[in-house]
Amino acid sequence: QPCPYPMAPPNGHVSPVQAKYILKDSFSIFCETGYELLQGHLPLKSFTAVCQKDGSWDRPMPACSIVDCGPPDDLPSGRVEYITGPGVTTYKAVIQYSCEETFYTMKVNDGKYVCEADGFWTSSKGEKSLPVCEPVCGLSARTTGGQIYGGQKAKPGDFPWQVLILGGTTAAGALLYDNWVLTAAHAVYEQKHDASALDIRMGTLKRLSPHYTQAWSEAVFIHEGYTHDAGFDNDIALIKLNNKVVINSNITPICLPRKEAESFMRTDDIGTASGWGLTQRGFLARNLMYVDIPIVDHQKCTAAYEKPPYPRGSVTANMLCAGLESGGKDSCRGDSGGALVFLDSETERWFVGGIVSWGSMNCGEAGQYGVYTKVINYIPWIENIISDF
């Protein structure tokens, strides 16, 4: 006896279409684009029913249910808005991701996603993955007038990238993105195999304040060209934090230098070093201090460190020097790893040009200069580490 004529479910069709279906005849159901076969709540790859000898089909008719992409994933440091309608997540629905204003900017795409037939929220560029809210770098409450000031107390928001590193000694670093710290290799060398021993603090001006944002290190990456106790060439390291920090006016990453950044770091251009290192009184500073210092001609700096007790070749092409010939303005012990920053007048963002590395035994000594790791030489190294890990 024939089986009942199969009625196609809404948004589906039967194939093949026959006048009647007898024993061993079969039909399949195909859904329109944007609809999927469901048996109950379970998706089916395909559906074929066979007519049995008792005149019944061997399987119940499935439904062609509209594809549902489901609630979109939360966007870290951002939000999502339903454009089509509140909570609408079905085929062709549109949502719009956006990043928290001021401190984050959207990377990858424009944040507009459509629910496609494959069940994925998909951007106009075809990406299935979430956009990225990347922290805006180089924002500071401070503006520079190009004058040289010395030993000033920092104000809230002046150096929001400043990181205090407590390990074996007091050192500094600068926040990159929201989960990396750029510092000097010599400052964290002892902790390279014990990253968790590093106590990392940010968002505070006072070195001893109990009010700070705590971060912990997941891994320490020291430049492979750095040799401890054999000079300071390649004195650069990256610390990966085990969690992203929340960006605000007191915690903001520093920018890495653009290719064009060298034009803002010529001899006599002013850079700013900040830290809690030794002051003229010989003690670690309680309050974050900063000093504006000019870049020194490389040959002049090399010559200054050619005489004993410094070994020949102490100053390499991977270093830059800053300070006054008359002395008095310098970084010092405890400032190690901190950023020497410059204002990119085109982007109006601060970027890290140098990392506090080494200098004369007596900080601020006349005729001697602070020596900083030249960050622009290490952009490929930094980018490789960050992209790989």
């Epitope: 709540h41 998706p43 790859k45 549902d68 069940g119």
Partner: antibody, heavy 118, light 107 residues
């Protein structure tokens, strides 16, 4: 993001009924997009699906357990529950609840260990 | 009742490709799902509907399913991928899990 948390007694006597509750936070159990499931894992062994429920009360059960299993839902508390009757030592396992979206379990609760022993 | 079979264990060197198989009668006709479970943790969905990857799952995880075999492939295997992997499918509205494969990353 949605989170699930299992709760209930860690020790049940043989022949008694095992009762567990899963509390859903960060999302509504009444969402039309989801079923909610129970899966268990005996110590050192693999996973076994027990059953799934929709917010309306519609259920699917594993045929091998169907005679002993009841899954229910309380939308007002954003919870769903498992009852397994006539338990034996073979029912000793970590019991997980999970969101069941069109057949895929994601995410899962942290699991709760239930020991059947007198 | 429907059964899914997996090799109990397999090992792979870091950076190499691991292919974990799951076999069942006409498995290719239905969707396969894969879960990763690390010691002491809950399972995590890594592949659904044969080859779809949930957000947050690295691109090195991929899946395929045809004939009687579904395969989870991990390319450029990392130490963090060491775990138990379970395949799962729905047969006649019944959820079925494979017995699991313990993946060891050498070194």
């Amino acid at each position: 993001q949605v989170q699930l948390q299992e709760s209930g007694p860690g020790l049940v006597k043989p022949s008694e009924t095992l009762s567990l509750t899963c509390t859903v936070s960060g999302g509504s159990i009444s969402s039309s997009s989801y079923y909610w499931g129970w899966i268990r894992q005996p110590p050192g062994k693999g996973l076994e699906w027990i059953g799934s429920i929709y917010y309306s009360g519609s259920t699917y059960y594993n045929p091998s357990l169907k005679s002993r299993v009841t899954i229910s839902v309380d939308t007002s508390k954003n919870q769903f529950s498992l009852k397994l009757s006539s338990v034996t030592a073979a029912d000793t396992a970590v019991y997980y609840c999970a969101r069941d979206r069109r057949g895929r379990f994601d995410p899962w609760g942290q699991g709760t260990m239930v020991t059947v022993s007198s | 009742s429907y059964e899914l079979m997996q090799p109990p264990s397999m090992s792979v060197s870091p950076g190499q490709t691991a292919s974990i198989t799951c076999s069942g009668d006409k498995l290719g006709d239905i969707y396969a799902y894969w879960y990763q479970q690390k010691p002491g943790q809950s399972p995590v969905l890594v592949i659904y509907q044969d080859n779809k990857r949930p957000s947050g799952i690295p691109e090195r995880f991929s899946g395929s399913n045809s004939g009687n075999t579904a395969t989870l492939t991990i390319s450029g295997t990392q130490a963090m991928d060491e775990a138990d992997y379970y395949c799962q499918a729905w047969e006649s509205s019944t959820g079925v899990f494979g017995g699991g494969t313990k993946l060891t990353v050498l070194g």
